[in-house]
C-alpha cells in the first residue's frame, strides 16, 4: 500500500423503521469480541439485501454504531448489544460514525480488506508528463512565429 492513510470521520443520525424481516444488518464487536484493536465498539459487518437498512441506504458496512434510541453502546458485551437492537422497537434511531478513508487526497469508504486508495504518484506522473508535452509544444509553436 502506498502513501499515508488518514480517515475522515463523520457522524449521522439514521432513523429506520423495522421492516417485515427486521432491521436487516449484522453487527460485530463488544467488550468480549473486539473487532478493531483497542476498540470495543459495535460495528456493522453486513447489510442484508432488501432489509430496512439496505433500502434506506445510509448505513454502510464498517460503520460504527454509537447509540440506539439514545442509548450508548460503549462498554457493552456483544450479546447485550444484540439484545438492545432486538428490543429497540418499531422505530429505531441510530447514531452512526462513518469512517471515510483518505489516502493522499482520494476518498473511498472503508471496506474489510486492504484500503484501495489511488497512490498519489499514479496521478502526478501523467499530469507532469502532459504538462511537459504541452510546454514543449508551446515553445515549438512560439519559435515558428
Amino acid at each position: 500500500m502506498n502513501g499515508r492513510v488518514d480517515y475522515l470521520v463523520t457522524e449521522e443520525e439514521i432513523n429506520l423503521t423495522r421492516g417485515p424481516s427486521g432491521l436487516g444488518f449484522n453487527i460485530v464487536g463488544g467488550t468480549d469480541q473486539q473487532y478493531v484493536s483497542n476498540d470495543s465498539g459495535i460495528y456493522v459487518s453486513r447489510i442484508k439485501e432488501n432489509g430496512a437498512a439496505a433500502l434506506d441506504g445510509r448505513l454502510q458496512e464498517g460503520d460504527k454504531i454509537l447509540s440506539v434510541n439514545g442509548q450508548d453502546l460503549k462498554n457493552l458485551l456483544h450479546q447485550d448489544a444484540v439484545d438492545l437492537f432486538r428490543n429497540a422497537g418499531y422505530a429505531v434511531s441510530l447514531r452512526v460514525q462513518h469512517r471515510l478513508q483518505v489516502q493522499n487526497g482520494p476518498i473511498g469508504h472503508r471496506g474489510e480488506g486492504d484500503p484501495s486508495g489511488i497512490p498519489i504518484f499514479m496521478v502526478l506522473v501523467p499530469v507532469f508528463a502532459l504538462t511537459m508535452v504541452a510546454a514543449w509544444a508551446f515553445m515549438r509553436y512560439r519559435q515558428q512565429l
Epitope: R18, N26, R46, R86
Partner: nanobody, 127 residues
Framework: HVQLVESGGRLVQAGDSLKLSCAAS????????MGWFRQAPGKEREFVAG????????NYGDSVKGRFSISRDNARNTMYLQMNSLKPEDTAVYFC?????????????????????WGQGTQVTVS
C-alpha cells in the same frame, strides 16, 4: 472468509446417540454465528440448531428440542452437535453454516438465507 468441514455422520440405530463436528478455518471463528441445518431427500433445508459467537445463546428447531445440543469451542475453531434419542425421521445430510457477526433481528439466525458459508455436509442415517 471461513471454510467449514463437517464430520461424524454415519449409520446408527433408532434411540442411539451421535456427535457431529464442524471444523472451521480462519482466525476470527469467535466472531461468527454458527448453525446446523439438515436436508432430507426431496425436502427443503431445515434449521436444526444455532449458536451465538460466544456460545452463550443457543436456539433449536422444534423437531429436535430436548434431544439435540449445540456447542462450540472457540479455542479449537470447532462447533458440535450432540444428537440423542435419534429417530428415523432425523435421517438427512447435516450441514454446518456460518455468518459473520450477529444479526440484530429476532429469528434471523433460523433462516437459510442469513448464512454465507456452508460445509459440504455429512450423512446421518437412522434405521
Amino acid at each position: 472468509h471461513v471454510q467449514l468441514v463437517e464430520s461424524g455422520g454415519r449409520l446408527v440405530q433408532a434411540g442411539d446417540s451421535l456427535k457431529l463436528s464442524c471444523a472451521a478455518s480462519g482466525r476470527t471463528f469467535s466472531t461468527y454465528t454458527m448453525g446446523w441445518f439438515r436436508q432430507a431427500p426431496g425436502k427443503e433445508r431445515e434449521f436444526v440448531a444455532g449458536t451465538s459467537p460466544s456460545g452463550d445463546n443457543r436456539n433449536y428447531g422444534d423437531s429436535v428440542k430436548g434431544r439435540f445440543s449445540i456447542s462450540r469451542d472457540n479455542a479449537r475453531n470447532t462447533m458440535y452437535l450432540q444428537m440423542n434419542s435419534l429417530k428415523p425421521e432425523d435421517t438427512a445430510v447435516y450441514f454446518c453454516a456460518a455468518f459473520r457477526g450477529s444479526c440484530v433481528d429476532y429469528g434471523c439466525d433460523f433462516r437459510v438465507s442469513q448464512y454465507d458459508y456452508w460445509g459440504q455436509g455429512t450423512q446421518v442415517t437412522v434405521s
